[in-house]
């Protein structure tokens, strides 16, 4: 119920021991009490006792003092409970009853007399504050006192307001005198169901799900969500938003791991080579003749650079090296020719020239050949045009680069954004790492490209009324509730009908 | 707790119109589910017409075709269009609404409608 009607009786004289109808008890006025508890009526009536009706067992003889008792027979102060809203008025009707009977339940006995009655009709507001009365009339007196106070969890002037209170995902409250919610510490909002942040947590990097709590938006890290993740892989940069990489001084590249100073601070070129600050490294040695590798390190064969000619093989000598000539050659690099046209020194479909009246020779070579004789082949890929690990193909008088993923160009010296094609669904943010695209994406989407949909379980927030089952499934953020005979609604809300008492009846 | 006023009854007769009226009070009426019930003397409130909390709409077989209820969110009222009254029409009309997340109901105190026949 919403609220108790309280009566107690505190004394009862009948000194003579007379009932209503002029006659005396014998022995004495063995007297019980009926009250009936009603609406307001100007005039009281017979009729039921609409706010509730409640008997005491015998509780003395003639005149006597009514003791508190908090429980079993002869309750004292009497409870009327009541699950409306308290109209603030009433009437009530006090009789005092003598039975020959039984003490404990002199309702049933038969030959009981009434011996006086009392009617109160008034008004009475809802409080802890007992109002006290006394009523005589010719043979007898009746001290009293009445209050109307309201059930647990029922607040207000009226007992109208139901608070229960909770701490649980519905909300965290306790509750306030009138009914109203006061939030548990580290709660807020109307129900008390929103969480207050740990103190500083960024109101836009930040968020929390229970007080004193900070978790980070995708590219925010630190206590409070203020610090940004700089971009994957990024060695010497900071960042101001997201997925930034701003180099410190003295480095470059994509992921700021390029020493642009890389020459001066690590000579890595030998052999007094000369270095400088490109590259895909970051620095570039240009050897010296006669030295080769990546630093320079190498001393070259002085028959590296292929000085004889005509198919002399070169042999390596102390300080410099000797051609050793085929046949129809000499000279220091077999650069002088016996032969003459008329040998047909000419390969692979070169032409013969006659020089110094026909004591030499000279060939004219067709495409993709070279060689005095037009005896070796054109290889374009000899001197690897092809940038960023492209691979080198010859195909008839060109050639070309076959280019690994992410470059293209006619070297393979240009590089393909991957976020180019723009790979992020759902509205995803797009960055270039070394590895491939990486994708941020927006609320309710995950997966490397955001393809994936963040479906919830409908039914956690226990959205349906009066005991109705919950179900999901049926359409991904969507839930149907089952309603219980009686209640009809999208989330079972409405009772089909209210008998009179039901408690939500004013 | 939203506040609600009826508005609307009176008396008329068989087979005539009524239109009644619930104004409520608070700004998030438009997250509420509202109702309309009636109590005839020494019967049960029996629930008349209601709009969900999805939109749907609910009425009792009794009124199915005669009566039609409607929200105004941006007045903060809801309404009952009653056609073709009956006798048995008559009672007390309360206006009822739930909130949205505890299920807790509120009440207006209701209005007379009499239907002479």
């Known amino acids: 119920g919403s609220g108790i009607f309280q009566l107690r009786l505190q004394e009862f004289v009948n000194q003579r021991g007379m009932l209503a109808n002029g006659q005396s008890c014998e022995p004495g006025c063995r007297t019980f009490f009926r009250i009936c508890l009603k609406h307001f009526q100007a005039t009281f009536s017979e009729g039921p006792c609409t706010f509730g009706n409640v008997s005491t067992p015998v509780l003395g003889t003639n005149s006597f003092v009514v003791r508190d008792k908090n429980s079993g027979s002869g309750r004292n102060p009497l409870q009327l409970p009541f699950n409306f809203t308290w109209p603030g008025t009433f009437s009530l009707n006090i009789q005092a009853w003598h039975t020959p009977g039984d003490d404990l339940r002199p309702e049933t006995s038969p030959g009981n007399s009434l011996i006086s009655q009392i009617i109160i009709q008034g008004s009475l507001a809802v409080g802890k504050i007992w109002r006290t009365d006394e009523q005589n009339d010719t043979l007898t007196r009746l001290s009293y006192s009445y209050r109307v106070i309201c059930s647990d969890n029922y607040y207000g002037e009226s007992c109208s307001r139901l608070c229960k209170k909770r701490d649980d995902h519905f909300g965290h409250y306790e509750c306030q005198p009138d009914g109203s919610l006061s939030c548990l510490p580290g709660w807020t909002g109307k129900y008390c169901d929103q969480p207050i942040c740990l103190s500083g947590c960024h109101e836009q990097n930040g968020y929390c799900s229970k007080p004193d709590e900070c978790i980070c938006r995708p590219g925010w890290q630190g206590r409070l969500c203020n610090e940004c993740i700089p971009h994957n892989g990024c060695r010497h940069g900071t960042c101001s938003i997201p997925w930034q990489c701003a180099c410190d001084e003295g480095w470059g590249g994509l992921f700021c791991d390029q020493d642009l100073n890389y020459c001066t601070h690590h000579s890595p070129c030998k052999n007094g080579s000369t270095c400088s600050n490109s590259g895909p490294k970051g620095y570039t040695c240009t050897c010296l003749p006669g030295y080769t590798g990546e630093h320079c390190e190498l001393g070259l064969s002085k028959c590296a650079s292929n000085p004889c000619r005509n198919g002399g093989s070169c042999k390596d000598q102390e300080n410099s090296y000797h051609c050793l000539c085929p046949p129809g050659y000499y000279g220091q690099h077999c650069e002088h020719s016996t032969l003459t046209c008329a040998d047909s020194p000419c390969f692979n479909g070169g032409s013969c020239r006659e020089r110094n009246q026909g004591s030499s020779y000279a060939c004219e070579c067709p495409p993709n050949f070279t060689g005095s004789n037009c005896e070796k082949k054109v290889d374009r890929c000899t001197s690897n045009p092809c940038a960023n690990g492209g691979q080198c193909q010859n195909r008839g008088p060109s050639r070309t680069c076959r280019c690994r993923p992410g470059f293209t160009g006619t070297h393979c010296e240009l590089h393909i954004s991957d976020c180019a094609r723009s790979p992020c669904a759902h509205g995803g943010t797009c960055h270039d790492l070394e590895n491939g695209p990486v994708c941020t994406c927006p609320a309710g989407f995950s997966g490397r490209r955001c393809e994936v949909r963040i479906t919830h379980d409908a039914c956690a927030s226990g959205p349906c009324f009066n005991g109705a089952t919950c179900y999901t499934g049926l359409s991904p953020n969507n839930f149907v509730c089952n309603c219980p005979y009686g209640f009809v609604g999208s989330r079972c809300e409405f009772p089909v009908g209210l008998p009179p008492s039901f408690p939500w009846v004013a | 707790e939203v506040q609600l006023v009826e508005s609307g009854g009176g008396l008329v007769q068989a087979e005539g119109s009524l239109r009644l009226s619930c104004a409520a009070s608070?700004?998030?009426?438009?997250?509420?589910?509202m109702a309309w019930y009636r109590q005839a003397p020494g019967k049960q409130r029996e629930l008349v017409a209601g709009i969900s909390f999805d939109g749907s709409t609910h009425y009792a077989e009794s009124v199915k075709g005669r009566f039609t209820i409607s929200r105004d969110d941006a007045k903060n009222t809801v309404s009952l269009q009653m056609n073709s009254l009956k006798p048995e029409d008559a009672a007390v009309y309360y206006c009822?609404?739930?909130?949205?997340?505890?299920?807790?109901?509120?009440w207006g105190q209701g209005t007379q409608v009499t239907v002479s026949s």
């Open positions: 009822y609404s739930v909130h949205p997340s505890t299920g807790f109901g509120s």
């Open positions: 608070g700004s998030t009426f438009s997250t509420y589910a």
